[in-house]
Interface confidence: low
């Protein structure tokens, strides 16, 4: 067990041309915070994959306000170290992701907004107990300077924090087979305590609590012999005639993998594939808990109150990802009403409204008809961002000032002739058709597809459209 420690020295513009503008302004003050994610080995994993060695979040830095247009200086940083405790051995090789986040403190709807300013990643070799290693990483126009180290927590020592030291019980030399625990003069290396019940003949361990099997033996405690010949029934009873060694229960029987891990057999033991948020030989260790604040952008962390349970981030609208670290296109939700144009400014959503509408989401319909008049008995109707007149029969145009030609649209079907009338239009239908617009055919036997013609009108008579 031990702690990985990260000290951020500076975050600011990198050398060379194209210095970035300050991420903060008088209008939009902000402050920085950092997140570190550690993974064992020299992996090239995606940023979203679990931080199997652990993760940590810094405190928020001091509030910073930059004058508009001024080049960005080194930004004020949070105090203190970022510490990532690790329970198992320090792997020696590790991958890191360090994210610089900006918390914007301007006047937003719904409180502060977070955005990722820069993300740097790297792969390093590092022995526990070594000095602070200094590093410079660049992300675009930004430069991050930091130091890091891994140190063991007593009683663990060594470059992997796997050796245990205990105070000497007497001022004499250390016990048989045990070395002095350099550099702690007054301590001795403690005997390695394997997993309880681990076979002393067929098992061994390289880390405390482990039980690794010698060849020919298997099972969680290395008490089960491995078959030396092929049996018809691999899990069947022993057969003296076939000379078959019974392997007994398989290493995955009973599923030794905790927290929903899936077990697969290996030539000498078993291997657990752990779900997100867990690692360790049996998926028994959680690298991140809700106490580490793994959910960004206002995400709600559920579960993970202790290191043996996973966490889930419930993301607020506009964010997704296992840690709510990815911003979704909030404009795809079409928040602007009445045809407004959506602008995602990062720190806030803005709607540019069409004429006649207002409000944060263009939800307010302005009074288009105020001071407007519609001529010739027309009535003003609000809507569509501009005033509109519903004109009386015989009139048209924006203000109902134009006399309408009701026949202009050729309303009479099937060759009917249109006649303008003071109250509208009249269609004189061609032989075989009837109806206000001559839309109905007359049946050959003289019956029509409509109920009987109104009294006083014979089929074929012109019908007025009232």
């Amino acid at each position: 067990a031990g702690v990985f420690e990260l000290q951020i020295h500076s975050f600011g513009p990198g050398p060379g041309p194209g210095a970035p503008r300050s991420p903060c302004s008088a209008r939009l003050p902000c402050r920085l915070f950092f997140r570190v994610c550690l993974k064992p080995g020299l992996s090239e994993e995606a940023a979203e994959s679990p931080c199997a060695l652990g993760a940590a979040l810094s405190a928020r830095g001091p509030v910073y306000t930059e004058q508009p247009g001024a080049p960005a200086p080194d930004l004020p940083l949070p105090d203190g170290l970022l510490q990532v405790p690790f329970r198992d051995a320090w792997p020696g090789t590790f991958s890191f992701i360090i994210e610089t986040w900006r918390e914007e403190l301007g006047d937003q709807i719904g409180g502060p907004a977070w955005s990722l300013l820069a993300r740097v990643a790297g792969r390093r070799r590092l022995a526990a107990g070594g000095p602070w290693a200094r590093d410079i990483q660049r992300a675009g126009a930004w430069e991050l300077r930091f130091s890091y180290r891994a140190r063991c927590e007593p009683p663990a020592v060594g470059t992997a924090c796997t050796r245990l030291c205990r105070p000497r019980s007497a001022p004499s030399r250390c016990g048989p087979g045990l070395r002095p625990c350099a550099p702690l003069e007054d301590e001795c290396e403690a005997p390695l305590v394997c997993r309880a019940g681990c076979s002393p003949e067929h098992g061994f361990c390289e880390q405390p609590g482990e039980c690794r099997c010698l060849e020919g033996w298997t099972g969680p405690l290395c008490t089960v012999p491995v078959s030396t010949s092929s049996c018809l029934s691999p899990r069947g009873p022993s057969s003296a005639t076939t000379g078959c060694l019974v392997p007994g229960p398989g290493p995955c029987d009973g599923n030794p993998c905790a927290n929903g891990g899936s077990c697969s057999e290996t030539p000498r033991s078993f291997e657990c594939t752990c779900p997100r948020g867990f690692y360790g030989l049996r998926c028994e260790v959680s690298g991140v808990t809700c106490a580490d604040g793994p959910c960004f952008n206002g995400g709600l962390c559920v579960g993970g109150a202790d290191p043996d349970s996973a966490y889930i981030c419930h993301c607020p609208p506009g964010f997704q990802g296992s840690n709510c670290e990815k911003r979704v296109d909030r404009c795809s939700l079409q928040p602007c009403r009445n045809g407004g144009l959506c602008l995602d400014l990062g720190h806030a959503l803005r709607c540019r409204c069409r004429a006649g509408f207002a409000g944060p989401r263009c939800e307010h319909d302005l009074d288009d008809c105020a001071g407007r008049a519609c001529a010739n008995g027309g009535t003003c109707v609000e809507g569509g961002g501009a005033h509109r007149c519903s004109c009386a029969l015989g009139f048209g145009g924006r203000d109902c000032r134009e006399r309408a030609d009701p026949c202009a649209a050729r309303p009479c079907a099937h060759g009917g002739r249109c006649y303008a009338h003071f109250s509208g239009l009249v269609c004189a239908c061609a032989p075989g058709y009837m109806g206000a617009r001559c839309e109905f055919p007359v049946h050959p036997d003289g019956a029509s597809a409509l109920p009987a013609a109104p009294p006083g009108l014979r089929p074929g008579d012109p019908q007025r459209y009232l």
Epitope: H9, P131, R134, R149, P183
Partner: antibody
């Protein structure tokens, strides 16, 4: 009370190897940087390099090709070797303890050893 | 990283307020210490992390920082304070000292 006691040859000829040792008495040997710093007569201080108990070290690039710092944790000692010395290496050499991550904290120093390089 | 210390020497009287500055060639955050050295002796730590007073050092010594400028102030100079003072940055390798300021009796 932590004490640093240093010793080594004080007079060398050009091209010889400077060798100094610093013993740490009292306090822990792990958890600190152990540094060598020198000061030519009448001049300022120059950092040479540092080591920790595990043997990891860092050196001043201006001297890196000639310098080696080693550690003997069983004796709580660390040593400096500087090869191919010239008159420019004439200086008082100090050993010092630096704390991890605390910001410029060389809190304990040896008494200093004057090393003169002369033909 | 170059540490430019000024003045290189100054003359003052007992009871005077004295200020010595070190300017870093680039940002070094608070990773700077101040040391006092008397002739024939090893340097002695006064201030670490730009403004933290080392245990056992009189409170008349103080340190401050403004961006890349660092100041050591002696509020009321005492006879035992006449010495040479050095700043040291440990923000980046190699660690570098300022050129020193010799405080002499006027």
């Amino acid at each position: 009370q932590v004490q640093l006691q240093q010793w080594g040859a004080g007079l060398l000829k050009p091209s010889e190897t400077l060798s100094l040792t610093c013993a740490v008495y009292g306090g822990s040997f792990s958890g600190y940087y152990w540094s060598w710093i020198r000061q030519p007569p009448g001049k300022g201080l120059e950092w040479i390099g540092e080591i920790i108990h595990s043997g990891s070290s860092n050196y001043n690039p201006s001297l890196k090709s000639r310098v080696s710092i080693s550690v003997d944790t069983s004796k709580n000692q660390f040593s400096l070797k500087l090869s191919s010395v010239t008159a420019a290496d004439t200086a008082v050499y100090y050993c010092s303890r630096g704390e991890y991550g605390s910001g410029s904290r060389f809190d304990y120093w040896g008494q200093g050893t004057l090393v003169t390089v002369s033909s | 990283i170059q540490m430019t210390q000024s003045p290189s020497s100054l003359s003052a009287s007992v009871g005077d307020r004295v200020a010595i500055t070190c300017r870093a060639s680039q940002g070094i955050r608070d990773d700077l210490g101040w040391y006092q050295q008397k002739p024939g002796k090893a340097p002695k730590l006064l201030i670490y992390a730009a403004s933290s007073l080392q245990s056992g050092v009189p409170s008349r010594f103080s340190g401050s920082r403004s961006d890349t400028d660092f100041t050591l102030t002696i509020s009321s100079l005492q006879p035992e304070d006449f010495a040479t003072y050095y700043c040291l940055q440990d923000y980046d390798y190699p660690l570098t000292f300022g050129g020193g300021t010799k405080v002499e009796i006027k």
